[in-house]
């Protein structure tokens, strides 16, 4: 069916950057200025996105691809194709509806965006805190407390005693 359709439909021969012009006997015409077609066989070209105001042009529109926007410094992109700009915060902060707020004690954020996350709980992995956490940085976990105790050595521990009631083999 696909092959039959393409044989009968002259529009399928129109490459990206053109459109199938019904007003000109379905000739492939170039996309007009400020429009594009990213795939072949299109009957119209799409209007290029305009990056206006705080949306800055990251990539210009071409006949085969839409423009790409980003946000003015101080804000970052959010949403598909940078449909929104969201405020940056400093490291050690998170964005709330009240603006940028410092991370609560026990949490950190090492980026200009995103939320404050809890410090790693080293003890869950049987480790100790080597470097304390801050608002900007997670804690650094070190060896387990047992490994740090005086007299601890790397000698293999003795085999566990046999359970009572078992005679030697």
């Amino acid at each position: 069916f696909e092959r039959t359709r393409s044989l009968q439909d002259p529009c399928s021969n129109c490459p990206a950057g053109t459109f199938c012009d019904n007003n000109r006997n379905q000739i492939c015409s170039p996309c007009p200025p400020n429009s594009f077609s990213s795939a072949g066989g299109q009957r119209t070209c799409d209007i290029c996105r305009q990056c206006k105001g705080v949306f800055r042009t990251r990539k210009e529109c071409s006949s085969t691809s839409n423009a790409e926007c980003d946000c003015t410094p101080g804000f970052h992109c959010l949403g598909a194709g940078c449909s929104m700009c969201e405020q940056d915060c400093k490291q050690g902060q998170e964005l709330t509806k009240k603006g940028c707020k410092d991370c609560c004690f026990g949490t950190f954020n090492d980026q200009k965006r995103g939320i404050c996350r809890p410090w790693t709980n080293c003890s869950l992995d049987g480790k100790s805190v080597l470097v304390n956490g801050t608002k900007e940085r997670d804690v650094v976990c070190g060896p387990s407390p047992a490994d740090l105790s005086p007299g601890a050595s790397s000698v293999t521990p003795p085999a566990p005693a046999r359970e009572p009631g078992h005679s030697p083999q």
Partner: nanobody, 123 residues
Framework: EVQLVESGGGLVQPGGSLRLSCVAS????????MNWVRQAPGKELEWVAN????????YYVDSVKGRFTISRDNAKNSLFLQMNSLRADDTAVYYC????FGYGDSHFGMDVWGQGTTVTVSS
């Protein structure tokens, strides 16, 4: 077409006042959080204030607290920023911006922006 148009900027002396307005069209204004954002010459974009749909929540950046007041009139699709005790460091282009769908829940992104109005504070 979804649009925001700011007005009310101008030249004012330190200590003076200005009232900025923003008129919305092409969407249901009363459904959205709204924001004022500014950009001082040579500086990054800075969020100034926001307001929720029914004016029960208003928040400000620390540097304008007690001097600026955000308000809205949903019947007139309008957002306002009353600026008192203006200082030289308030000089900036002021933008009105719509909080995108889900603003305050999943994100704080702003999807529709005005063209800006310039405020110059100088003696």
């Amino acid at each position: 077409e979804v649009q925001l148009v700011e007005s009310g900027g101008g030249l004012v002396q330190p200590g003076g006042s200005l009232r900025l307005s923003c008129v919305a069209s092409g969407f249901n204004f009363s459904n959205y959080w709204m924001n004022w954002v500014r950009q001082a010459p040579g500086k990054e974009l800075e969020w100034v204030a926001n307001i929720n749909q029914d004016e029960s929540e208003k928040y400000y950046v620390d540097s304008v607290k007690g001097r600026f007041t955000i308000s809205r009139d949903n019947a007139k699709n309008s957002l306002f920023l009353q600026m008192n005790s203006l200082r030289a460091d308030d000089t900036a282009v002021y933008y009105c911006a719509r909080g995108g769908f889900g603003y305050g829940d999943s994100h704080f992104g702003m999807d529709v922006w005005g063209q800006g109005t310039t405020v110059t504070v100088s003696s």
